[in-house]
Amino acid sequence: RDKVMSEFNNNFRQQMENYPKNNHTASILDRMQADFKCCGAANYTDWEKIPSMSKNRVPDSCCINVTVGCGINFNEKAIHKEGCVEKIGGWLRKNVL
């Protein structure tokens, strides 16, 4: 179980790196973030560390109310601050693992 979670964490972070470059990856991550109401791997600040992402933005799928451009120059109160690895991991533990 721990190995699966560790793999999921690594994979999620790897996909974050590809987010700006790959539309398919972006749509998968967007779906996960929107569905699970989460942002980033550990938390939303992970997006700040992606070199090809602008420092003042997160994907729109992180927004509580998703609209085009809502992740630009974001306010913390307008986005999901919790990380996806923990949130989705909890769901996996409960329903799959």
């Epitope: 938390n43 700040e48 602008s54 003042n56 451009g69 809502c70 630009i72 120059n73 306010n75 109160k77």
Partner: antibody
């Protein structure tokens, strides 16, 4: 009503330090990013630093990087700017500025506090 | 970094005149453009946000336009209290947040 009151400015020698404070009232402090913006005498506006609602995100202008540190105390509704290794070109009025983010602009500014760096 | 260039840097006008100040960004900033008014010895005041939205309490003679890289601030009929310095500012790509160099509006 919204109020931002800066304090801590004054005359300091080059290489010295100063800590600016900003007391915020009349709004929910944690709903906003906060900024320091400065204006040298007779010059334009220059962004110095911002900090996110929780304090998790902080950025400084290149001109002050490694010398100035922004912080906030949400329990005290206060914003701070620790300024070290001050130089003559840091002489300016420093404004504490509220930032709703997105495309809304800097909607409230303090009255400013003057920092003079001179020997 | 995104550079903001205002023109003109100063202009003289009379009460009742229609005045337009322009601001150009070095790359597209969509509509993340704000305008401020500053009077001597005072803090700046937000006039227009999101390129064209009037901030609460600002007279309707002020209007903003544009998107992408080119923006305008228009004062339809100058009043004595409008003589001041005006700044544009972008928040689309930051840090750093950048301002134009300012436009000083003087009485002719």
């Amino acid at each position: 009503q919204v109020q931002l009151v800066e304090s801590g400015g004054g005359l300091v020698k080059p290489g010295g330090s100063l800590r600016l404070s900003c007391a915020a009232s009349g709004f929910t402090f944690t709903d906003y990013f906060m900024n320091w913006i400065r204006q040298a005498p007779g010059k334009g506006l220059e962004w110095v630093s911002y900090i996110s609602n929780s304090g998790a995100i902080k950025y400084q202008a290149d001109s002050v990087k490694g010398r100035f540190t922004i912080s906030r105390d949400n329990a005290k509704n206060s914003l701070y700017l620790q300024m070290n290794s001050l130089r003559a070109d840091d002489t300016a009025v420093y404004y504490c500025v509220r930032d709703p983010r997105s495309y809304y602009g800097f909607d409230y500014w303090g009255q400013g506090t003057l920092v003079t760096v001179s020997s | 970094d995104i550079q903001m260039t205002q023109s003109p840097s100063s202009l003289s006008a009379s009460v009742g005149d229609r005045v337009t100040i322009t601001c150009r960004a070095s790359q597209s900033i969509r509509n993340f453009l704000n305008w401020y008014q500053q009077k001597p010895g005072k803090a700046p005041r937000l006039l227009i946000y999101a390129a064209s939205s009037l901030q609460s309490g600002v007279p309707s003679r002020f209007s903003g336009g544009g998107s992408g890289t080119d923006f305008t601030l228009t004062i339809s009929s100058l009043q004595p209290e409008d003589f001041a310095t005006y700044y544009c500012q972008q928040s689309y790509s930051n840090p750093p947040i950048t301002f134009g160099q300012g436009t000083r509006l003087e009485i002719k």
